[in-house]
Interface confidence: low
Amino acid sequence: LQDLCSNCPAGTFCDNNRSQICSPCPPNSFSSAGGQRTCDICRQCKGVFKTRKECSSTSNAECDCISGYHCLGAECSMCEQDCKQGQELTKKGCKDCCFGTFNDQKRGICRPWTNCSLDGKSVLVNGTKERDVVCGPSPADLSPGASSATPPAPAREPGHSPQ
């Protein structure tokens, strides 16, 4: 025997109190799939959250973070305070990156500068709190008579951790 509720489309719920009639979701609620026996309460974007997409009868609201904060987690479940480039967020607030580390974003942690010597390269541009070092040709490549066909290795793309 087919469940009559399966005929109820998204945006409605199957009202068992009314002979399984499909009733529209009440205000501030939604059902994103058919055959639902209840509608879900819409997410409310309050406090540090701001609304990116309004709730509709068939889809939940989507939130962003207010200025000075950024999203964390799936579907922006949390907002975390921004820091400046060259800083990371600790339990005590934003702190400057320690020497030898950098952060080129307003979020995330300070990461160690690339160790150019591991790749047999030399440091072409020194690192700062905000930027990674740029590795250049190895010292051997710079010796007189050495071929200079190898271009300097580019700096890593901002925001990407080394693989």
Partner: antibody, heavy 119, light 107 residues
């Protein structure tokens, strides 16, 4: 059953824009996001962007923001992706795929359209 | 963007073998990891979502595990139809990103 139907192949001249289609059936079209994914020959998969047919809200991968435009026609349950000024770099298989909400997986895929950009 | 790395691009195995395919994310993706199978004809199917949940109709010889940044897909008792390419994909953050794929070949 759920189906996402795509033409098997499209040929376009370099520079002439092209519009790929994806016809959905077997489910409520307005309740699922439609995504587009690119695959160059012998390469991996790249997410281009998605559109929510209910209100045409879109998200784009920054890499494709100036290349792809996503639209839907609710009356025919069809999603479209227009590629502007195609070059040989745009020659690839393009898949449409759907997901339900935020972090859901892509649970159904079209067969893919092989786009060839050639003069 | 979150980078997804499948360090093994191809893998050879025999019928009946048990194989594990790994995938690493460049940051914690809180279990929002999905696995897809692509057949040589281009057909793509969802196998596993949210790290370990089997999609409907997928045989139980497929399983997934992992947490944080490291995830894996295991296929036990390999069958002929399992020789294909497998992709991981994160659903944690936009843009959604895929691993480069692991092609499973018959030995």
């Amino acid at each position: 059953q759920v189906q996402l139907q795509q033409p098997g192949a499209e040929l376009v001249r370099p520079g002439a824009s092209v519009k790929l289609s994806c016809k959905a059936s077997g489910y409520i079209f307005t309740s699922y996001w439609i995504n587009w994914v690119k695959q160059r020959p012998g390469q991996g998969l790249e997410w281009i962007g998605n559109i929510y047919p209910s209100d045409s809200y879109t998200n784009y991968n920054q890499k494709f923001k100036d290349k792809a435009t996503l639209t839907v026609d609710k009356s025919s349950s069809t999603a479209y992706m227009q590629l502007s000024s195609p070059t040989s770099e745009d020659s690839a298989v393009y898949y449409c795929t759907r997901f339900h909400y935020g972090s859901s997986p892509f649970d159904n895929w079209g067969q893919g359209t092989t786009l060839t950009v050639s003069s | 963007d979150i980078q997804m790395t499948q360090s093994t691009s191809s893998l050879s195995a025999s019928l009946g073998d048990r194989v594990t395919i790994s995938c690493r994310a460049s940051q914690d993706i809180s279990h929002y990891l999905n696995w897809y199978q692509q057949k040589p004809d281009g057909t793509v199917k969802l196998l596993i979502y949210y790290t370990s949940r089997l999609h409907s109709g997928v045989p139980s010889r497929f399983s997934g595990s992992g947490s944080g940044t490291d995830y894996s897909l295991t296929i036990s008792n390999l069958e002929q139809e399992d020789f294909a390419t497998y992709f991981c994909q994160q659903g944690h953050t936009l843009p959604r990103t895929f691993g480069g794929g692991t092609k499973l070949e018959i030995k």
